[in-house]
């Protein structure tokens, strides 16, 4: 059995990707320059470390987290890297055009790379719902549309709702989840007879998925604190995220055992639930004043995550065609919503405490912000799904879903691996 792309895609992918890369290079040539201001090297290194943490989260963490399929682990990791590399380039340009362009040129700083990496992370969260059912050419489209939609959402939220970088980037969880789910809903769903085993997890890929989860777990405090303005805010965000993810690990493992009739622990639950606390405290990580509150939120998030992993996959598989092990989409949609609700509850408590109508107005604004993020995610996701269904992309046939051999050369294997 030949391990090649169909001829048409073999022509389409390199042409499409390299033309796009050439266009990006030209845009960088004409419209960008580096920040030439004086910076001391020590400060520069410290600032770079946050960006490095985010890159590790994206490339290794999310790359390996999605690699648990028996026959699709290579593609999961490599396609994630491809999307990250492309997404960061486009996000830097887009953020620059949206926020700086009136001044003539886009100035690239370490902060803009940090922002771009976080924008690209959105795609890596979303793509979990469609990996295995799309080829690289389709993923390029998904990267471009999603990064563009997120960039515009952030600009609109910043201008209309007066939110800072941290607050508008923390919509990433909800945005990415709903974007991914709506793309998945548009793609062909049924797995034909005989291919069901491909979307099952295997021991070694599951181990690499756990490795991904560990990297995400270690670096989640960096993600939640990356865009905060002062050391005191960042310190609180790091502490609270750490407490929340620590408790969500304990909750995930014990909750997974509790949810199983024989008390066994599910790998799939644990992969995802260990991150629950970090997502749930994301929006308000710097606002939580004491460890016990962060820990309670981590506990609740862990329970919701395990509960969701137990009861939602059936529904997601039926309605959206998402395999049981791809639980990041609905996990993040639940936990992202929980995080947003926690922030809104803090505002409501302010309103009650102050008896101030203006703070009540802030609650409405926050609900409006969340609603806008969900609406834009769903609309842009549906648009992407429709685009991905176009014949020009030569999508893999349903019988070839979740199969590395469709995309990779395995000289030592004739069939399967």
């Amino acid at each position: 059995m030949s391990s090649k792309y169909p001829r048409s895609v073999r022509r389409c992918l390199p042409l499409w990707a390299l033309t796009l890369e050439a266009a990006l290079i030209l845009l960088f040539y004409f419209f960008t320059h580096y920040d030439a201001s004086l910076e001391d090297q020590k400060g520069l290194v410290a600032s770079y470390q946050v960006g490095q943490d985010l890159t590790v989260m994206a490339a290794i963490g999310l790359g390996f987290l999605t690699s648990s399929f028996r026959r699709h682990s290579w593609s999961s990791v490599a396609f994630n890297l491809f999307m990250l590399a492309l997404g960061v380039q486009w996000a830097i340009l887009l953020d620059g055009f949206l926020s700086q362009f009136p001044s003539g040129k886009v100035v690239i700083t370490l902060f803009s790379i940090r922002l771009a990496t976080m924008s690209a992370l959105s795609v890596l969260i979303s793509v979990d719902a469609v990996l295995g059912k799309v080829n690289l050419a389709q993923l390029v489209v998904m990267v471009l549309v999603e990064v563009t939609a997120l960039g515009n959402l952030r600009m609109v939220i910043s201008n209309i709702f007066n939110t800072d970088y941290h607050m508008n980037m923390m919509h990433i969880y909800v945005f990415a989840a709903y974007f991914g789910l709506s793309v998945a809903w548009c793609l062909p769903k049924p797995l034909p007879e005989g291919t069901e085993d491909k979307d099952q997890t295997a021991t070694i890929p599951s181990l690499s998925a756990m490795l991904g989860a560990l990297f995400l777990w270690m670096f989640w405090p960096s993600f939640n604190s990356a865009l905060l303005r002062s050391p005191i805010e960042r310190k609180n965000a790091v502490f609270n995220t750490y407490y929340a993810v620590a408790v969500s690990v304990v909750t995930a493992i014990s909750g997974s055992s509790l949810a199983h009739p024989q008390g066994k622990i599910s790998k799939t639950y644990v992969h995802s639930a260990v991150l629950a606390g970090g997502v749930a405290v994301g929006t308000s990580c710097h606002l939580i004043p004491s460890p016990w509150l962060a820990m309670v939120l981590g506990l609740v998030a862990g329970l919701i995550s395990v509960g969701g992993a137990k009861y939602l996959p059936g529904c997601c598989n039926r309605v959206l065609g998402i395999p049981h092990s791809s639980i990041m989409g609905y996990n993040f949609s639940l936990l992202g919503l929980l995080g947003e609700i926690i922030y809104i509850v803090l505002l409501v408590l302010d309103t009650v405490g102050a008896g101030n109508g203006m703070i009540g107005f802030q609650v409405l604004l926050s609900i409006g912000e969340l609603s806008l993020a969900i609406v834009i995610a769903l609309m842009s996701g549906l648009l992407t799904g429709l685009l991905l269904n176009l014949k020009i992309w030569k999508a893999p046939h349903e019988a070839k879903y979740f199969d590395d051999q469709v995309f990779w050369k395995f000289p030592h294997l004739a069939v399967g691996f």
Epitope: S47, T109, L110, N162, Y165, S230, E233, S290, I359
Partner: antibody
């Protein structure tokens, strides 16, 4: 004691460049964001730019965007403002100021309040042909 | 951007008078408002932050109030050293910090 000292002001022709410096002492410079604020003769205060404590992020007023660049060297405890393409309307006293933050909390939430708590004595920039 | 409007732009008062300066924001800024005092030829000085909290070392005759869009700076008993220009400043809409146009307090 806590102190900020600006330097580098002077008379310059329109279209030319100038670089202002602000030397900080008496506090941990690398833990604070820093601002430039200006005041045209007989006018009010106008915020110009801010840089985060680690230099990772910078913001500018629309009136100077693309012409002015704020930077810092934490190893030298110094803040800079590079001013290019100067115009007559840039004539002002330029102050550097420390971005101070304080936190208050109740049982469920932190509140962060910012202010400019330490100011330099100012340096005068005159743009004239 | 958020606009800050101070009133009056100047006022004359005598030592011992109670003085009130108001500041209005073009949209709600919660309590994210500061008051500064600037004497001629000097740098500004932070008086009040978070709309109503006195910065350390500031005399208790100064007080601030308000939330949302309307704020007030009150000097309960004007002293000779209080004759200066007062500015309000919002920082709700970061990354831009906006000052009011200033209120000059002069000796009657």
């Amino acid at each position: 004691q806590v102190q900020l000292v600006e330097s580098g002001g002077g008379v310059v022709q329109p279209g030319r460049s100038l670089r202002l410096s602000c030397a900080a002492s008496g506090f941990t410079f690398s833990s604070y964001g820093m601002h430039w604020v200006r005041q045209a003769p007989g006018k009010g205060l106008e915020w110009v730019a801010v840089i985060w404590y680690d230099g990772s992020n910078k913001y500018y007023a629309d009136s100077v965007k693309g012409r002015f660049t704020i930077s810092r060297d934490n190893s030298k405890n110094t803040l800079y403002l590079q001013m290019n393409s100067l115009r007559a309307e840039d004539t002002a006293v330029y102050y550097c100021a420390r971005d101070w933050v304080t936190r208050s909390s109740n049982w469920y939430r932190n509140y962060y309040y910012y202010g400019m708590d330490v100011w330099g004595q100012g340096t005068t920039v005159t743009v004239s042909s | 951007d958020i606009q800050m409007t101070q009133s009056p732009s100047s006022l004359s008062a005598s030592v011992g008078d109670r003085v009130t300066i108001t500041c209005r924001a073009s949209q709600s800024i919660s309590s994210y408002l500061n008051w500064y005092q600037q004497k001629p030829g000097k740098a500004p000085k932070l008086l009040i932050y978070a709309a109503s909290t006195l910065q350390s070392g500031v005399p208790s005759r100064f007080s601030g109030s308000g939330s949302g869009t309307d704020f007030t700076l009150t000097i309960s008993s004007l002293q000779p050293e209080d004759f200066a220009t007062y500015y309000c400043q919002q920082y709700y809409r970061t990354p831009t910090w906006t000052f009011g146009q200033g209120t000059k307090v002069e000796i009657k």
